[in-house]
Interface confidence: medium
């Protein structure tokens, strides 16, 4: 809306940088062959690049990433009883970001 | 995978709390009748509840919200020339979060 301008502060661009995000740990990251288990914790924090760039033709992208293995519980349900095992999930953290030109493929002439 | 357990730290649950997120300001928030304009900035930071709860039947939800009006530039393109106007967009910030029971509708018997 165009109303109530006086009370509104000028919007500040969300700069392109790393922010803490929540990553859902899906079961197929651990075992694609079996669905009869639960994962704990179901979500973890990761660092990810987000935000906008000063130009329409550029995009906020990770310029440096780090893989971080973490242990989760794989809770298998066998005959209605749980069996607790450890599993390793590798998370991707973004360490640095940059505004990168979007390369659009040229049409073939 | 169940390999390389030694190097991996135990995963820590992403607790239910407010985190800084990036909100894309879509054009239809400003004017649904006209697509012939740009918005600046294209994205801003907001506070939003995210994360997981310690229980299967609960979900991380906002328990307190605040509406925050911000001024953006509406850049209309008229005869290939830009016309700058102000517009107000109301953002929703989450101030507090809680793990709330998911109410699943009971089947009608």
């Amino acid at each position: 809306s165009l109303g109530s301008l006086a009370a509104a502060e000028p919007a500040v661009i969300a700069e392109c940088k790393t922010r803490t995000e929540v990553f859902q740990i899906s079961r197929n990251l651990i075992d694609r062959t079996n669905a009869n288990f639960l994962v704990w914790p179901p979500c973890v924090e990761v660092q990810r690049c987000s935000g906008c760039c000063n130009n329409r033709n550029v995009q906020c992208r990770a310029s440096q990433v780090q893989m971080r293995p973490v242990q989760v519980r794989k809770i298998e349900i066998v005959r209605k009883k749980p069996i607790f095992k450890k599993a390793t999930v590798t998370l991707e953290d973004h360490l640095a970001c940059k505004c990168e030109t979007i390369v659009t493929p040229r049409p073939v002439t | 995978s169940l390999g390389s357990l030694a190097a991996a730290e135990p995963a820590v649950i992403a607790e239910c709390k407010t985190r800084t997120e990036v909100f894309q300001i879509s054009r239809n928030l400003i004017d649904r009748t006209n697509a012939n304009f740009l918005v600046w900035p294209p994205c801003v930071e907001v506070q939003r509840c995210s994360g997981c709860c310690n229980n299967r039947n609960v979900q991380c939800r906002a328990s307190q919200v605040q509406m925050r009006p911000v001024q953006v530039r509406k850049i209309e393109i008229v005869r290939k020339k830009p016309i700058f106007k102000k517009a107000t967009v109301t953002l929703e910030d989450h101030l507090a979060c809680k793990c709330e029971t998911i109410v699943t509708p009971r089947p009608v018997t």
Partner: antibody
Framework: EVQLLQSGGGLVKPGGSLRLSCAAS????????MSWVRQAPGKGLEWVSY????????YYADSVKGRFTISRDNSKNTLYLQMNSLRAEDTAVYYC?????????????WGQGTLVTVSS | SYELTQPPSVSVSPGQTASITCSGD??????VHWYQQKPGQSPVLVIY???KRPSGIPERFSGSNSGNTATLTISGTQAMDEADYYC?????????FGGGTKLTVLG
Amino acid sequence: EVQLLQSGGGLVKPGGSLRLSCAASGFTFSSYAMSWVRQAPGKGLEWVSYISDDGSLKYYADSVKGRFTISRDNSKNTLYLQMNSLRAEDTAVYYCARHPYWYGGQLDLWGQGTLVTVSS
Amino acid sequence: SYELTQPPSVSVSPGQTASITCSGDSLGSYFVHWYQQKPGQSPVLVIYDDSKRPSGIPERFSGSNSGNTATLTISGTQAMDEADYYCSAFTHNSDVFGGGTKLTVLG
């Protein structure tokens, strides 16, 4: 204050019954799994029974299976252990304890313990 | 049934490092927790998920777990650390405790 307050212990004859209670306060009881753990005089800790947050899952140590029943009343914030057909070897201090998650995990809060003596 | 084995006793001089082991078949595949119990008191969680420390537990307590052995390490042991220590793991639908280790702080 976050605590577990136990009651119901005492002296009982072999073959007799007893019900232990564990009243929770200071936290949302219905969000946590609970267990009973016992300790015979001068001995180590022995896990007895587990119940999930909503009471749908219950597990028992082989030594008490068929004789002990774990239950909970989330509306009263209370955990119970019904002990039947008691034997001399059930003599122990019984602790109720809280798991931080619905599925179990470590025991992060313990009751003060209550002594159960089975003797004729 | 699954068994966890601990040494009955460990002695250490004040200020030294005490290590208490807990062994079980493929124990590294399970999360191990450690409890401290002083005479006449309820147990207290000191390490969970192999190596995590609950709030309020001093930094001198640490843990590790791989292969068939989990270890509780107390660095700079103090007289107040004298207690019984129990390892625990949730395996096949039951919580299993080790037999316990009596830690004696000499002097």
